[in-house]
């Protein structure tokens, strides 16, 4: 018969032959042959594979480093990775929770809407027109642009969400 060019789900093509993939939690030891099935072995104690696979090495479970403020939220199995979370009062820096911060800062162009607490992180908001923030801060709100008019000056450079307006003297020359 004609050798296959594609295989069924949970199979892979090798040496013109369809072999079974290893199930989650197991790694590939040897490909199948005309006469033998795919050989798989369970992952070790601190390892996992979470898909049907042909991997020859299992992945190491994530380490929740206490020096980064991390602790184990859910212990890994042979089929799942360990899930880390932060110590109480700390907040993950990303969805993957690779490190923790006491709170996040709002970038330039954003102001603090709500200062962090033990349970909630800093809430930032974009500076609206007429306001700016030129710093990274965990407590500063957006500042209003300087009013040149009240200083008897004129706007020489428009403000942005990250910069204040630049005021200058009025042009005394009249046509």
């Amino acid at each position: 018969p004609e050798p296959p060019t594609a295989c069924r789900e949970k199979q892979y093509l090798i040496n013109s032959q369809c072999c079974s993939l290893c199930q989650p939690g197991q790694k590939l030891v040897s490909d199948c042959t005309e006469f033998t099935e795919t050989e798989c072995l369970p992952c070790g104690e601190s390892e996992f594979l979470d898909t049907w696979n042909r991997e020859t090495h299992c992945h190491q479970h994530k380490y929740c480093d206490p020096n980064l403020g991390l602790r184990v939220q859910q212990k890994g199995t042979s089929e799942t990775d360990t899930i880390c979370t932060c110590e109480e009062g700390w907040h993950c820096t990303s969805e993957a929770c690779e490190s923790c911060v006491l709170h996040r800062s709002c970038s330039p162009g954003f102001g603090v809407k709500q200062i962090a607490t033990g349970v909630s992180d800093t809430i930032c908001e974009p500076c609206p027109v007429g306001f700016f923030s030129n710093v990274s801060s965990a407590f500063e709100k957006c500042h209003p642009w300087t009013s040149c008019e009240t200083k008897d000056l004129v706007v020489q450079q428009a403000g942005t969400n990250k910069t204040d307006v630049v005021c200058g003297p009025q042009d005394r020359l009249r046509a």
Epitope: N67, L68, T93, L102, R104, S105, S137, A138, E140
Partner: nanobody
Framework: EVQLLESGGGLVQPGGSLRLSCAAS???????EMWWFRQAPGKGLERVS?????????YYADSVKGRFTISRDNSKNTLYLQMNSLRAEDTAVYYC?????????WGQGTLVTVSS
């Protein structure tokens, strides 16, 4: 390597005063907002006060407003917290921290005990 070293803690009677210092090294001090946190025995971390890099903007928790004053001397790379009218509930380990507020960007703390 960022280093933050707090000092100035101690035992003080209610109504007394203390001045905490935080000596900073390993980064451009003037370019960073700084915070004071505290942790009372068996409690979570509490945000006490913050100051902008220039020193022009400050923040105080309601519990310390009017009693504590945060300041900084950028020429000495040092952050301060002047604590007046101390109360028993101010007893805690006080920490300084810099942005980003990660585990390696805060100090070891100094213990303040307010007791008669």
């Amino acid at each position: 390597e960022v280093q933050l070293l707090e000092s100035g803690g101690g035992l003080v009677q209610p109504g007394g005063s203390l001045r905490l210092s935080c000596a900073a090294s390993g980064f451009t001090f003037a370019g960073y907002e700084m915070w004071w946190f505290r942790q009372a025995p068996g409690k979570g971390l509490e945000r006490v006060s913050a100051i902008s890099g220039s020193g022009g903007s400050t923040y105080y928790a309601d519990s310390v407003k009017g009693r504590f004053t945060i300041s900084r001397d950028n020429s000495k790379n040092t952050l301060y917290l002047q604590m007046n009218s101390l109360r028993a509930e101010d007893t805690a380990v006080y920490y300084c921290a810099k942005d980003p507020y990660s585990f390696d960007n805060w100090g070891q703390g100094t213990l303040v005990t307010v007791s008669s």
